[in-house]
Amino acid sequence: KFSKQSWGLENEALIVRCPRQGKPSYTVDWYYSQTNKSIPTQERNRVFASGQLLKFLPAAVADSGIYTCIVRSPTFNRTGYANVTIYKKQSDCNVPDYLMYSTVSGSEKNSKIYCPTIDLYNWTAPLEWFKNCQALQGSRYRAHKSFLVIDNVMTEDAGDYTCKFIHNENGANYSVTATRSFTVKDEQGFSLFPVIGAPAQNEIKEVEIGKNANLTCSACFGKGTQFLAAVLWQLNGTKITDFGEPRIQQEEGQNQSFSNGLACLDMVLRIADVKEEDLLLQYDCLALNLHGLRRHTVRLSRKNPIDHHS
């Protein structure tokens, strides 16, 4: 639960955050797990700890291993683990899978590629961007803050993108690179006023008391990747997170699907252990984008369990 994988290349800077989060005032001690040796805090060391951060300036293959961070409040010590792997630099252009960060998708309307992990570093713009090891040049490519914007995206823009930047630590500069794949959805997109496919307006959903129930809010917003679109549930006009009922939760994240070429989003509302009082609540499926907001209301009714006779 409190273990995190991190990776980097030899002779580059690598900064790792302790997976165990605490309040800002808490101190953090780092140890190399295999030897239980404390990581120094003095910045003159190549590897040193700085609060929640562990810094390799620069990293070496021999640094690979599991590092323990202990977050200390005045009365409690809690432990996290960082599994660090430092790889040798590749002589050829191919970036192996184990060095790749999560893939991102884009389209003509939305082509941002964020540079992974950059928020951990002390860097200054501009970033350098490479595609398949070639420096990106031309007016279609714009390095903006911590991301790359590609104008007029085409299918040929798919590939592996590497961001390169300089981390500065007390006047010394260290190179950092990070690579992720970019895929392109090749479509001419447009945006519509949201259309809610489910639930139907004023739908009554039958549920069994004591059982779990799922409600799906599904809406379509147009064709292609949508710049601003969201579906969510409200209870009695209140956001789920503010309602404060831990049994009723929205599914983490929104599922994106393309139905008949349309861009649609789903949000599942999960009700654990349905109670009588749940039947009194108003469940609103909300779909919104730049055109506006549409709302469909659902209510729950008791479903009488069917008697089974042998």
Epitope: K1, G22, K23, S73, T75, F76, R78, D242, G244, P246
Partner: antibody, heavy 123, light 107 residues
Framework: EVQLLESGGGLVQPGGSLRLSCAAS????????MIWVRQAPGKGLEWVSS????????YYADSVKGRFTISRDNSKNTLYLQMNSLRAEDTAVYYC????????????????WGQGTLVTVSS | EIVLTQSPATLSLSPGERATLSCRAS??????LAWYQQKPGQAPRLLIY???NRATGIPARFSGSGSGTDFTLTISSLEPEDFAVYYC?????????FGQGTKVEIK
Amino acid sequence: EVQLLESGGGLVQPGGSLRLSCAASGFTFSIYDMIWVRQAPGKGLEWVSSIRGEGGGTYYADSVKGRFTISRDNSKNTLYLQMNSLRAEDTAVYYCARDPWSTEGSFFVLDYWGQGTLVTVSS
Amino acid sequence: EIVLTQSPATLSLSPGERATLSCRASQSVDDDLAWYQQKPGQAPRLLIYDASNRATGIPARFSGSGSGTDFTLTISSLEPEDFAVYYCQQYITAPLTFGQGTKVEIK
């Protein structure tokens, strides 16, 4: 020294209301999540409600949802529990307690507890 | 909600003996489990957090172990002041839940 002092308990008829208070001292009250836990006579511990620090998000046990309201006044270092529509089964010692760690979306243990205040619901 | 089941309900032992208390969760709580001690007329006192870490000021004779669904509180050698009721509590998710308690009494 961290101290939590509950007050406001007493005898109330079924259907009645009470407001419990918990005065906190010895720590920066506003940054800590606070919790109410109750214990019926001769029974075990039951979590009642939690409130986040400055964010103020609230959580309730099913048994009190819609009847009890947790709140806090950070300027007065005080935690409250407004109890309405009281029932005989709400009879218990009510403790306020501190969660010393929790970050957004997480919970932790209860490291400091008050001495408790007895609420008796009876006609 | 996550149900915590403690066993045994009562443990009758003599001072100096070893006490082993069990707490089983209905689903995994990772290591998000605590143990409390409660004496009559007093508020609970935190003993163990994160399944195995002793809280500040807790004697070394108290130790916790386990992860996932099965947890144990061990008192290596009972002192007279250790006779009390012990509760486990999970904090991986709301609602926070407690076990029903194990009473450690003098034999």
